[in-house]
């Protein structure tokens, strides 16, 4: 139904990493424009991305107000140049998105190894606590702030001279591991939320190896 020259949006998809959240859809518009609305289950609809020819809408500002809420979005289609025109039912065509709960579903961004320091046969590896777009008291919260005890990191490490990997886990942003004296090691980390059923793990961080700038070696 609807006017002859508008089609409803389809394939509405949430793309979200570290709470940066964009709704995408199809098709590319031909003689039509879109407006997006977002709501919590119990809240009012709020309009965003008015009469756009884009097929995406950044909804980050809305979802970061409460990342534990469940959100629903819908995309309205209007004829280009005649946005007052409606479908046969008296309202514009629209399509609903899947429900989205940011806290449970946002992808974990690729972590970064901030530093590593060797003291004798111990190495301390520190993961950068990445800033999110979630705010409290006008301050942007870090990933650790937001996820707290739900977030762990897994460290993969191996001797530069071999391929056998070892793993360690931490519920902070730091690892303290034992290494063999005189050996160089390489490191990669991964963020994990074990309690999730989807998007449990980030991609691995870039590999950092001892003997490069990022680390510090102290013979004790």
């Amino acid at each position: 139904s609807g006017t002859t020259n508008t089609v409803a949006a389809y394939n509405l998809t949430w793309k979200s990493t570290n709470f940066k959240t964009i709704l995408e859809w199809e098709p590319k518009p031909v003689n039509q424009v879109y407006t997006v609305q977002i709501s919590t289950k119990s809240g009012d609809w709020k309009s965003k991305c008015f009469y756009t020819t884009d097929t995406e809408c950044d909804l980050t500002d809305e979802i970061v107000k409460d990342v534990k809420q469940t959100y629903l979005a819908r995309v309205f289609s209007y004829p280009a140049g005649n946005v007052e025109s409606t479908g046969s039912a008296g309202e514009p065509l629209y399509e609903n998105s899947p429900e989205f709960t940011p806290y449970l579903e946002t992808n974990l961004g690729q972590p970064t190894i901030q530093s590593f320091e060797q003291v004798g046969t111990k190495v301390n590896v520190t993961v950068e606590d990445e800033r999110t777009l979630v705010r409290r008291n006008n301050t942007f919260l870090s990933l650790r702030d937001v996820f707290g005890k739900d977030l762990i990191y897994t460290l993969y490490y191996w001797k530069s001279s071999s391929s056998g990997k070892k793993t360690a886990k931490t519920n902070t942003n730091e690892f303290l591991i034992d290494v063999d004296k005189g050996e160089n090691y390489c490191f990669s980390v991964q963020a994990v939320i074990p309690s999730r059923t989807v998007n449990r793990k980030s991609t691995d961080s870039p590999v950092e190896c001892m003997g490069q700038e990022k680390g510090e070696f102290r013979e004790i």
């Epitope: 809420q69 709960t101 409290r136 059923t197």
Partner: antibody, heavy 121, light 109 residues
């Protein structure tokens, strides 16, 4: 407003099981851990375990492993705690609790009214 | 399993200040232990004062504050009221489980 409504008092015989319910309302049920804490008469608080309703992920106190099971029913926003092989020392008030979320923070902010479970032959 | 230790009892004068401590048998308490402080008055359900080390609930009176001091979590009460007489429990998170302390009985006298 957040509310946690627990089921009524129970009297059980040693060796039996008890299933206590905690019905949540006023928030997004799936996103918050529900903690179970018990308090024996005249004693302190003891953590039993937790469940995240969205994924049914659970963590249990080692002391109760094998005896405690936590489940949830998302259609009714209710969490259940079942304790089996009851003994007299399980006589306690059983509480469910939920954290207050500020963008971060974890713990025991909102509490149910408690369910008294009495184990007696 | 870790043991969490609190002072069994403390006394404070009305209008006075007092610090309750929460120690961990495994070493220093850090922000990763997400210290919680819970108040319980006789015959009542527990109520939260502090979660996540230092976050007050909107219902928590401003005279209560949580922090880490040295190697332990502390709850400071500034300007005690008669109604603050209660048991106070701390709880610490250890990677995959919570542990409660034995509680501190605070008397306002």
């Amino acid at each position: 407003q957040v509310q946690l409504q627990e089921s009524g008092a129970e009297v059980k015989k040693p060796g039996a099981s008890v299933k206590v319910s905690c019905k949540a309302s006023g928030y997004t049920f799936s996103s918050y851990w529900i903690e179970w804490v018990r308090q024996a008469p005249g004693q302190g608080l003891e953590w039993m375990g937790e469940i995240l309703p969205g994924s049914a992920s659970t963590k249990y106190n080692e002391k109760f492993k094998g005896r405690v099971t936590m489940t949830r029913d998302t259609s009714t926003s209710t969490v259940y705690m079942e304790l089996s092989s009851l003994r007299s020392e399980d006589t306690a008030v059983y509480y469910c609790a939920r954290d207050y979320y500020y963008g971060s923070s974890y713990g025991f902010a909102y509490w149910g009214q408690g369910t008294l479970v009495t184990v007696s032959s | 399993q870790a043991v969490v230790t609190q002072e069994p009892s403390l006394t404070v004068s009305p209008g006075g200040s007092v610090t309750l401590t929460c120690r961990s048998s495994t070493g220093a308490v850090t922000t990763s232990n997400y210290a919680n402080w819970v108040q319980q008055k006789p015959g009542q359900t527990p109520t939260s004062l502090i979660s996540g080390t230092n976050n007050r609930g909107p219902w928590t009176p401003a005279r209560f504050s949580g922090s880490i001091l040295g190697d332990k979590a502390v709850l400071t009460l500034w300007g005690a009221h008669a109604e603050d007489e209660a048991d106070y429990f701390c709880a610490l998170w250890y990677s995959n489980h919570w542990v409660f302390g034995g509680g501190t009985k605070l008397t306002v006298l």
